[in-house]
């Protein structure tokens, strides 16, 4: 039971992409605020976002503290302008959010690819090593060091007058391929971690073609 | 439980069509990569071509290529075979795979496979 | 594309042999070479990836190795239900291709 007038939030919903997380609910506020908690499964709660009209809240800064936890969020319902009221039973209306384990479940971003380096017939390419919110003795880590040896790399890499793409797998972020002499090829990435069974793969990297400025030949 | 099963294998004249479905089920296609492989009666196994599901990339064996197309719907978790101007060689058992995406595992799940036969 | 040249094409064992396949790479393939299993009218099974790792479920007589271009499959001592069809695989570049199989017979 909850304070006349105030609806509890439903829909509650991660949205996680590189850590940057934030919880969404619905409904939009009519004549009520909200505030959120959040805590691992054995700690405390904490308060975020007091009292807001917005029906969302970034909980980076306490899920990066360690994205191997799993982490469960509330969010509590008040009448707006009267934020010390409570329902019957003596607390808020609030709604539990799914549990949440970031390292599991937060989506890959999209990739860059950094550079490409043609040498006779291969070509080396690099994949950006894109830096995270989470940090280790005041350093932001990138994706691969959060991750390690579970992110890898696949490449898709086409000639430019075909459209079978061919694919390599990396575990580090350089691609070493072989290519035919004289023809340009086209290249694309995707993220992709395969120990995990949801959330797996990224969205494809733009597209990067030889014979752009990303790239650099040289005839050996 | 990870599973595959194939469909649509049957007897077919040179030159005509058929296609094969394979449906998952256990795991979401969109996640990895399906590859089909075939293998001709008292043969070796042969590797006919694959499909990301998440954004539609292929790539063909050159003894299938522009007769054959792979394609998939996620919303049925599904992938397809289209194969036409079928030639008598192309009668085998084909086999859908699951490729489980990493540097060292491959082809992990496998369906048991349909039989097409071309033959007037 | 990459040619895998297995051998031998068949032999005949006993239960409680121990039996190699071998499968040459016709260029370096790193240790993206898997092995698979495959029973009269059945599907294909992973025994062996990345060269010499075990698949979950798979008994420990099987293992694999790898020199150079050179992989190799062993059975350290054959058992009734292991008469089959063995293949290797590469999966070091597209187009993966297999080996011709090796059909392994009871003597």
């Known amino acids: 039971s909850g304070t006349t007038n105030t609806v509890a939030a439903y829909n509650l919903t991660w949205k996680s992409t590189n850590f940057k997380t934030i919880l969404e609910w619905e409904p939009k506020p009519v004549n009520q605020v909200y505030t959120v908690q959040i805590s691992t499964k054995s700690g405390d709660w904490k308060s975020k976002c007091f009292y807001t009209t917005d029906t969302e809240c970034d909980l980076t800064d306490e899920i990066v503290k360690d994205v191997k936890q799993t982490y469960l969020a509330r969010v509590f319902s008040y009448p707006a302008g009267n934020v010390e009221s409570t329902g019957s039973a003596g607390e808020p209306l609030y709604e539990n959010s799914p549990e949440f384990t970031p390292y599991l479940e937060t989506n890959l971003g999209q990739p860059t690819i950094q550079s490409f380096e043609q040498v006779g017939t291969k070509v080396n390419v690099t994949v950006e090593d894109e830096r995270t919110l989470v940090r280790r003795n005041n350093t932001f880590l990138s994706l691969r060091d959060v991750f390690g040896k579970d992110l890898i790399y696949t490449l898709y890499y086409w000639k430019s007058s075909s459209s079978g793409k061919k694919t390599a797998k990396t575990n580090t972020n350089e691609f070493l391929i072989d290519v035919d002499k004289g023809e340009n090829y086209c290249f694309s990435v995707q993220a992709v971690i395969p120990s995990r069974t949801v959330n797996r793969k990224s969205t494809d990297s733009p597209v990067e073609c030889m014979g752009q400025e990303k790239g650099e030949f040289r005839e050996i | 439980e990870v599973q595959l099963v194939e469909s649509g294998g049957g007897l077919v004249q040179p030159g005509g069509s058929l296609r094969l479905s394979c449906a998952a089920s256990g795991f979401t296609i969109s996640g990895y990569w399906i590859h089909w492989v075939r293998q001709a009666p008292g043969k070796g196994l042969e590797w006919v071509g694959y499909i990301d599901p998440a954004n539609g990339f292929t790539y063909y064996a050159d003894s299938v290529k522009g007769r054959f197309t792979i394609s998939a719907d996620t919303s049925k978790n599904t992938a397809y075979l289209q194969m036409n101007s079928l030639r008598a060689e192309d009668t085998a058992v084909y086999y859908c795979?699951?490729?489980?995406?990493?540097?060292?595992?491959?082809?992990?799940?496998w369906g048991q496979g349909t039989l097409v036969t071309v033959s007037s | 594309d990459i040619q895998m040249t297995q051998s031998p094409s068949s032999l005949s064992a006993s239960v409680g042999d121990r039996v190699t396949i071998t499968c040459r790479a016709s260029q370096d393939v790193n240790t993206a070479v898997a092995w698979y299993q495959q029973k009269p009218g059945k599907a294909p099974k992973l025994l062996i990836y990345s060269a010499s790792f075990l698949y979950s479920g798979v008994p420990s007589r099987f293992s694999g190795s790898r020199s150079g271009t050179d992989f190799t499959l062993t059975i350290s001592s054959l058992q009734p239900e292991d008469f089959a069809t063995y293949y290797c695989?590469?999966?070091?570049?597209?187009?993966?291709?297999f080996g011709q199989g090796t059909k392994v017979e009871i003597k």
């Open positions: 695989q590469q999966h070091y570049t597209t187009p993966p291709t």
């Open positions: 795979a699951r490729d489980y995406g990493s540097v060292r595992v491959f082809l992990d799940y």
